[in-house]
């Protein structure tokens, strides 16, 4: 289980019309359900129920972003419609280039994502917990354009923007 | 089929507030942003700001903060935007419309928009 | 903010080929959509992501571009099209172009 490490891009506009760019580095693990892969894209924050249903109603796809789903406690959803790796497996299908699952509030998923499979995805699968998580999924909630890049190896520097 | 049934026109007075709704159907609402967006003749198309149904989080153009205020109703799938202290300048027709999957993605579906003319 | 800049109008023949200009005053990466207006309607998705047509859209049209120089193309041009044309970036939060009205002679 090698340490993925996961650097995110936040712009901020001001009253001005400037732009301020925010870069948070943050750690977590590739899970054996995917590929130890660098990746990047746009953060899209996806509940888990989010990811049961089909959309067949949709008819147009973006590729290329970054899934993020917090995980809930297992008490909440004794039948979950998919499995954590199903999950990911939906995501991936729907134009996800990785995702990250925060699995602090159901640790159990990291033993689930890690249970050797015979088909894992061909895009990382990373999990994140702790503080790592908490720092991601503020950036999320701001409802702001974010951009993660995921990489197996420590970045070389603090980047300021990198391009999609 | 994805669709946004926005509410009817509005002819309001300065100084005081008017609230535009926007009813979703043909998907679940809780799974994808909402944005606000306005046009005039004179300033073009100007995005407002956006929310999310699922956890009610919002961000603003900074020009709208103070004036437009986002909310939404999950069990009746709407969506809503405050227009408060309404001056002439806030005369305008005023669009809900969906993202695609990403913040960053296209408005791929729009509502019909709201006329709203402030006037005395 | 990024500002989107568009020529105002342009009129052309059924059967031409025309091209629609958008020019971002920084770097947006492929971030471009494109929209067309009809009067009294709301506008309607062509092109996502500079490149990419949208369901229901003749292939007719199409989009290209990156950085900061990004082209609507319509070949051929057919009466129905007479419309104004927006572009709009959503690299960081979202910014309109101003639009291009195109008339048929």
């Known amino acids: 289980k090698e340490t993925a490490f996961v650097e995110v891009v936040l712009f901020e506009s001001s009253p001005s019309g400037d732009y301020t760019t925010y870069t948070t580095g943050l750690t977590g693990r590739f899970s054996r359900a995917g590929a130890t892969l660098s990746a990047e894209g746009e953060i899209v924050q996806m509940h888990p129920l989010g990811l049961c249903n089909n959309n067949d109603e949709e008819d147009l796809y973006e590729y290329g972003w970054v899934g993020v789903v917090k995980l809930e406690q297992p008490e909440l959803d004794p039948k979950p419609c998919l499995t954590v790796l199903g999950k990911a497996k939906r995501a991936v299908q729907r134009g996800a280039t990785a995702v990250i699952f925060d699995v602090s509030e159901n640790p159990e998923a990291i033993d689930q994502l890690n249970q050797g499979s015979e088909d894992p995805l061909k895009r990382p699968v990373v999990y994140v917990k702790g503080a790592d998580a908490i720092k991601l999924m503020n950036i999320v909630n701001k409802q702001k354009v974010a951009r993660a890049r995921i990489q197996h190896r420590p970045p070389r520097q603090p980047t300021e923007y990198f391009d999609m | 089929q994805v669709q946004l049934q926005q509410s009817g026109a509005e002819l309001v007075k300065p100084g005081t507030s008017v609230r535009l709704s926007c009813k979703a159907s043909?998907?679940?609402?809780?799974?994808?942003?909402m944005n606000w967006i306005k046009q005039t003749t004179g300033q073009g198309l100007e995005w407002i700001g956006i929310?999310?149904?699922?956890?009610?989080?919002?961000n603003y153009n900074v020009r709208f903060k103070g004036k437009a205020t986002l909310t939404v109703d999950t069990s009746s799938s709407t969506a809503f935007m405050q227009l408060s202290s309404l001056t002439p300048e806030d005369s305008a027709v005023y669009y809900c419309?969906?993202?695609?999957?990403?913040?960053?993605?296209?408005?791929?579906?729009w509502g019909q928009g709201t006329l709203v003319t402030v006037s005395s | 903010d990024t500002v989107l800049t568009q020529s105002p109008a342009l009129t052309v023949s059924p059967g031409e080929r025309v091209s629609i200009s958008c020019r971002a005053s920084?770097?947006?990466?492929?971030?471009i959509h494109w929209y067309q207006q009809k009067p009294g309607q709301q506008p309607k998705l062509l092109i996502y992501?500079?490149?990419n047509l949208a369901s229901g859209v003749p292939a007719r049209f199409s989009g290209s571009g990156s950085g900061t120089d990004f082209t609507l193309t319509i070949d051929p041009v057919e009466a129905d099209d007479t419309a104004t044309y927006f572009c709009?970036?959503?690299?960081?939060?979202?910014?309109f172009g101003t639009g291009t009205k195109l008339e048929l002679k």
């Open positions: 419309a969906r993202n695609l999957i990403t913040i960053a993605g296209p408005f791929a579906y």
């Open positions: 920084e770097g947006v990466s492929s971030y």
């Open positions: 043909g998907y679940t609402f809780t799974h994808n942003h």
């Open positions: 709009q970036q959503s690299w960081i939060d979202h910014t």
């Open positions: 992501k500079a490149s």
């Open positions: 929310i999310n149904p699922g956890s009610g989080g919002t």
